[in-house]
């Protein structure tokens, strides 16, 4: 025997109090599938949340965040403060990226610049707080005779070619020094990160999943370290 409730479409519920008649969902509730015995209460977007999509009898409301915040969590169950590019969110609010790191978004953490030398390339454009370094061709590609087909060079005075050679050597030396400096810098940063992990701690952690996304929900109330409430420090 077929369940009479299975005939009730989305936007209705099977009303046991009225001989299993299909009744429309009451205001501020919905049923997204047929055959439901109750309608679910619509989500309400309050506080830092704002309504992105109104609730209807067949679909739930959808929330997003007020300006200056972005969604986190499934279905935007939490909002996190935006920062500027070149910054990351910490316990104390938005802080500039440390030297050697960058963030090109309004959310997330500062990431280390690409180490061009690891790919045997050279730094073409230096990194900033907002942008990663741009890696160029490897130093070998820049050296004379590296290209298999070279157009005949116009005849020049001996003095001129000496100037070009000196300039090239100076540039190569500078590049090598820069690469050595950057490599050393990253080694030191790695050592500091290992030795003093608390310096690099984010304000708020997601507790599930392998890749822990780091977010700022809130810090505890400073005056209640031993017990009491938690509070958000911007």
């Amino acid at each position: 025997l077929q369940d009479p409730c299975s005939n009730c479409p989305a936007g209705t519920f099977c009303d046991n109090n009225r001989n299993q008649i299909c009744s429309p969902c009451p205001p501020n509730s919905f049923s997204s599938a047929g055959g439901q015995r109750t309608c679910d209460i619509c989500r309400q977007c309050k506080g830092v949340f704002r309504t992105r999509k109104e609730c209807s009898s067949t679909s739930n409301a959808e929330c997003d965040c007020t300006p200056g915040f972005h969604c986190l969590g499934a279905g935007c169950s939490m909002c996190e403060q935006d920062c500027k590019q070149g910054q990351e969110l910490t316990k104390k609010g938005c802080k500039d990226c440390c030297f050697g790191t960058f963030n090109d978004q309004k959310r997330g953490i500062c990431r280390p610049w690409t180490n061009c030398s690891l790919d045997g390339k050279s730094v073409l454009v230096n990194g900033t707080k907002e942008r990663d370094v741009v890696c160029g061709p490897s130093p070998a590609d820049l050296s004379p005779g590296a290209s298999s087909v070279t157009p005949p060079a116009p005849a020049r005075e001996p003095g001129h070619s000496l100037q070009v050679l000196t300039l090239f050597l100076a540039l190569t030396s500078a590049l090598l020094l820069a690469l050595i400096f950057i490599t050393l810098l990253f080694s030191v940063l790695k050592w500091i990160r290992k030795k003093f992990p608390h310096i690099f701690k984010q304000p708020f952690k997601k507790t599930t999943g392998a890749a822990q996304e780091e977010d700022a929900c809130s810090c505890r109330c400073p005056q209640e370290e031993e017990g009491g409430g938690g509070g958000y420090e911007l």
Epitope: R43, L72, Y232
Partner: antibody
């Protein structure tokens, strides 16, 4: 430092009203909402209502007819008033700050213990 | 109203153990759930919001999980200071509602 300090009477007679003031420091009422939650003796927590940073209020339907929440941003005070008290309104009343990231309570006042008795 | 059910009123555990406090919503609330700890004689303290995001300063032995209707607060390596009552709360819709609480007893 973030603090919510409550002041109010400990004993109220039946049918009288309850007034509690929640004075906040370390944050602004123009940025954060403040909720009111109560806890009857030996029982769980019950949400009563909230006043948002823009001054709008939302109340639990079960209390809407006898509850009023107002605030004064300049003095950083939130005022809670509940009328027509009965014995079953005996509880600890808390003010709590709304988290900036969701609709939850990230910092709580110390609580005001209310006894409704003649 | 959305009813949050914490079926276990009391749970007994020993220091160093792992314990899971459960909470069931009467309808799908996505991940709009927070958890609180209330030590005896104190105000509640926020532990978790958005079902699985830990508040800063909360020890990482506290883990939140779940979505839809079933939610869990797991405390691994239980410490004596974890003796408290734990409440879940939904913020999907008004009225905001709490579970009835689960009291954690340390043997």
């Amino acid at each position: 430092q973030v603090q919510l300090k409550q002041s109010g009477p400990g004993l109220v007679q039946p049918s009288q009203s309850l007034s509690i003031t929640c004075t906040v420091s370390g944050f602004s009422l123009t940025t954060y909402g403040v909720h009111w939650v109560r806890q009857p003796p030996g029982k769980g927590l019950e949400w009563l209502g909230v006043i948002w940073s823009d001054g709008n209020t939302d109340y639990n339907d079960a209390f809407i007819s006898r509850l009023s929440i107002t605030k004064d941003n300049s003095t950083s005070q939130v005022f809670f008033k509940m009328n027509g008290l009965q014995a079953d309104d005996t509880a600890i009343y808390y003010c709590a700050r709304n988290s900036i990231t969701s609709v939850s309570f990230d910092c709580w006042g110390q609580g005001t213990t209310l006894t409704v008795s003649s | 109203d959305i009813v949050m059910t914490q079926s276990q009123k009391f749970m007994s555990t020993s220091v160093g153990d792992r314990v899971s406090v459960t909470c069931k919503a009467s309808q799908n609330v996505g991940t709009t759930v927070a958890w609180y700890q209330q030590r005896p004689g104190q105000s509640p303290k926020a532990l978790i919001c958005s079902a699985s995001y830990r508040y800063s300063g909360v020890p990482d032995r506290f883990t939140g999980s779940g979505s839809g209707t079933d939610f869990t607060l797991t405390i691994s390596n239980v410490q004596s200071e974890d003796l408290a009552e734990y409440f879940c709360q939904q913020y999907n819709s008004y009225p905001l509602t709490f579970g009835s609480g689960t009291k954690l007893e340390i043997k």
